[in-house]
């Protein structure tokens, strides 16, 4: 028998520095977690203790903090090289800055293979990107070899900016011939490493003949066997065992997100490459694990540029950006409109001639808007200003909801109106009218939404049984501020870009902004 240790991360999202327990900015260092310096300490410890170790990343290193905003992926290549990752799968967020923003900082600089079997380049891009990412890689480990096949969510064109010269194929259809080829070449230990979410990971384990282990990402799935060490609630045991169609037991793993845990899986293979046993658990990277001094010093060196960046002007406002709780928790506020407009703008993807865009709606809890921006400071808007407005380090995500769920959400928005509570919704691509004289749960009297399947966008009444795409903060997608109906009833949830980054990019693009209060949210006569 031959034993392999798989160390894995996924959805790190730019958390190069240690973070608080909820993966936001580290405040009290003695209680902070994760970060590449701490990760390196643990990885090195395991490499020294065990003979056959692979360090893998299942995608979405890009996007999430000011590190990515400033360094645009160069930081990912630099620190992943320093940690000596063995392979990485492409995630959807790796395309956030277009294909060029993937090729130049990451693909050309990475000293490890970057993989995806279901992304096919065409046209002029095919020769430019040739060999920079691969469908699979055969890695020597000790006296044996292991084949790693990559995959990426086929929803990427709706979630990011891969352009028109990359085709995202069905994962299972694309993986099978690559695995078959590896088998023909007598590579008999095969790991599928990819970024399509836990459901697809399980399907790959079930359907792709010859895959021995699946290491996934995208859905931020936390798996654990025994008592979990922090706040995350396990979605199942680690590893999660899937019985394949040909009767094999295939371990599937994921390691939550944000570099908080290091996935640790031990696999035992027989001489024919069959999995005999698998066991392990994610390792919580808490403050009991010291940060590696050399990596930490490097982080501090790279940090200097971030501090300079946060005071630079992104653009100007010629109007007061009203982000006060007195406005945003009671009525339409122009800061809410600005943020929602930025959220929609960030999700413009013309992937189908029938649609002007795939999504037109935005909702945003007023309680998430934490500060106004005064235009009387020469109109200057900096990252620092935006960090005061959006201090929680969240993301603006894409969900699919039924109209009936949206109606419930808007009822919840005003169910206890007047108490300055955070659930009051700011909107984009939505016209809502409330009648506060009616009883809670029956106060939405008009709800019109902007069409997407149209050449001239216009507002139509919400249909209860129709499925709509909506951009919203991850806080709401996860049921925050009492929006349990969103969490419970959403049909699909894809994590998006860092909130501040979305707004800063929009302001930089527009150069000068002047958002107005324009009647998106109204109260019917006699009640307000």
């Amino acid at each position: 028998a031959w034993e392999l240790t798989i160390l894995h991360t996924n959805d790190v999202h730019s958390r190069l520095e240690q973070t608080s327990e909820d993966s936001s900015k580290c405040v009290n260092a003695s209680r902070c977690m994760g970060g590449v310096a701490r990760l390196f300490t643990k990885v090195q410890q395991i490499r020294r203790a065990e003979p056959n170790v692979l360090l893998l990343d299942a995608g979405d290193q890009y996007q999430g903090t000011i590190w990515f905003t400033v360094y645009k992926g160069a930081e990912v290549a630099h620190f992943m090289n320093a940690l000596r990752y063995d392979a990485m799968a492409l995630g959807n967020h790796e395309f956030d800055n277009g294909v060029e923003g993937l090729i130049e900082p990451l693909l050309k600089e990475a000293k490890f293979p970057i993989l995806s079997a279901n992304i096919k380049a065409k046209g002029p891009l095919a020769s430019q990107i040739s060999g920079l990412y691969l469908p699979y890689k055969v890695l020597p480990v000790g006296d044996e070899v292991v084949g790693i096949v990559g995959y990426t969510s086929k929803e990427t064109p709706f979630l990011s900016n891969p352009g028109t010269n990359l085709v995202f194929e069905d994962e299972i259809t694309a993986l099978q011939p690559e695995v078959d080829k590896l088998k023909t070449l007598n590579v008999n230990k095969i790991i599928a490493l990819g970024h399509s979410g836990f459901e697809m990971d399980k399907l790959i384990a079930q359907k792709v003949r010859g895959v021995d282990v699946v290491v996934g990402g995208h859905s931020n799935t936390f798996l654990y066997t025994g008592n979990p060490p922090s706040k995350e609630v396990p979605a199942g045991k680690y590893p999660f065992i899937v019985t394949s169609d040909d009767g094999r037991k295939v371990p599937v793993v994921q390691a939550y997100a944000f570099g908080k845990y290091l996935g640790y899986l031990k696999i035992e293979f027989d001489e024919r490459g069959n999995v005999i046993s698998s066991h392990g658990n994610p390792i919580l990277l808490n403050s009991s694990i010291p940060e590696d001094p050399s990596i930490k010093a490097d982080i501090n060196k790279w940090r200097i540029k971030l501090d300079n960046y946060s005071t630079q002007e992104l653009g100007k406002t010629i109007v007061y950006l009203d982000g006060s709780s007195q406005s945003c928790r009671f009525r339409e506020c122009n800061m809410g409109n600005l943020i929602c407009d930025a959220m929609i703008n960030n999700n413009l993807r013309h992937t189908d001639e029938m649609f002007w865009n795939h999504v037109s709606m935005c909702i945003l809890n007023g309680g998430g808007i934490r500060s106004p921006i005064d235009e009387r400071n020469n109109g200057t808007i900096t990252w620092e200003n935006l960090a005061a407005v959006l201090p929680f380090g969240g993301t603006f995500d894409l969900v699919q909801l039924k109209g009936s769920t949206l109606k419930k959400a808007f009822e919840h928005s005003v169910h206890r109106y007047g108490q300055s509570t955070g659930e009051f919704l700011q909107v984009g691509g939505i016209h809502v009218v409330y009648d506060l004289s009616r009883k809670p749960g029956d106060r939405v009297v008009k709800l019109d939404v902007l069409c997407t399947k149209c050449r001239v966008p216009s507002y139509d009444p919400l249909k209860m049984d129709e499925v709509y795409k909506v951009i919203l903060p991850n806080f709401l997608a996860n049921g925050g501020d009492g929006f349990q109906m969103i969490k419970d009833e959403l049909l699909r949830h894809d994590s998006g870009d860092q909130d501040i980054n979305v707004v800063s990019t929009y302001i930089s693009k527009m150069k000068v902004i002047y958002p107005a209060v324009e009647g998106r949210i109204k109260f019917s006569t006699g009640s307000h």
Partner: antibody, heavy 117, light 110 residues
Framework: EVQLLESGGGLVQPGGSLRLSCAAS????????YSWVRQAPGKGLEWVSA????????YYADSVKGRFTISRDNSKNTLYLQMNSLRAEDTAVYYC??????????WGRGTLVTVSS | QSVLTQPPSASGTPGQRVTISCSGS????????VNWYQQLPGTAPKLLIY???QRPSGVPDRFSGSKSGTSASLAISGLQSEDEADYYC???????????FGGGTKLTVL
């Protein structure tokens, strides 16, 4: 010790048939894929055919497709190459080779096939 | 005519370093691992390098391999008289669905 021993070579007339065998020892035969590679006198190496570990997948060079058949018998630890419709240009030393990991890692000593009238 | 192109001959004096190149295309070297074989006169080929740059046990570290894009190379440092042999590069070809060998390079130690 890993050993691959070819047999079945010899002189055959054009259009004739020959069956090559390769007996394996010193390792678990069924865990590997195999290939046949040939070398014409004074020339370079030319891949002929390959068979997967399970025997479910077979591959052939265009020059032999439709004339040669690769097969294996795991119970006998033996690899075969059935060669039909032989031509003068098939004259070569035929090597039985084990596929290691993404490579041909072990070779037999070879058996000479001469096609001549 | 092989699809993998090698120089037909190379030479060097004892102690010297020689490099043998192997040029292919996206469907073979571009997408697959390259192997190198040594064939001494009158013997079967022997694996020298696999997975582009890995040496099997028993192969001296004077032999090293590398790959970049659609080309690969074999370097032999500290050349010795017993290195005089034919050297072949080989890889799988995705289009042909089979193995490809280079035409071979005859190395002479002067």
């Amino acid at each position: 010790e890993v050993q691959l021993l070819e047999s079945g070579g010899g002189l055959v007339q054009p259009g004739g048939s020959l069956r090559l065998s390769c007996a394996a020892s010193g390792f678990t035969f069924s865990s590997y894929a195999y290939s046949w590679v040939r070398q014409a006198p004074g020339k370079g190496l030319e891949w002929v055919s390959a068979i997967s570990g399970s025997g479910g997948s077979t591959y052939y060079a265009d020059s032999v497709k439709g004339r040669f058949t690769i097969s294996r018998d795991n119970s006998k630890n033996t690899l075969y190459l059935q060669m039909n419709s032989l031509r003068a240009e098939d004259t070569a030393v035929y090597y039985c080779a084990r596929l290691g990991y993404s490579t041909i890692d072990k070779w037999g000593r070879g058996t000479l096939v001469t096609v001549s009238s | 005519q092989s699809v993998l192109t090698q120089p037909p001959s190379a030479s060097g004096t004892p102690g010297q370093r020689v490099t043998i190149s192997c040029s292919g295309s996206l469907s073979n070297i571009g997408r697959n691992e390259v192997n190198w074989y040594q064939q001494l006169p009158g013997t079967a080929p022997k694996l020298l390098i696999y997975l582009n740059n890995q040496r099997p046990s028993g192969v001296p570290d004077r032999f090293s391999g590398s790959k970049s894009g659609t080309s690969a190379s074999l370097a032999i440092s500290g050349l010795q008289s017993e290195d005089e042999a034919d050297y072949y590069c080989a890889t799988w070809d995705d289009s042909l669905k089979g193995w490809l060998f280079g035409g071979g390079t005859k190395l002479t130690v002067l």
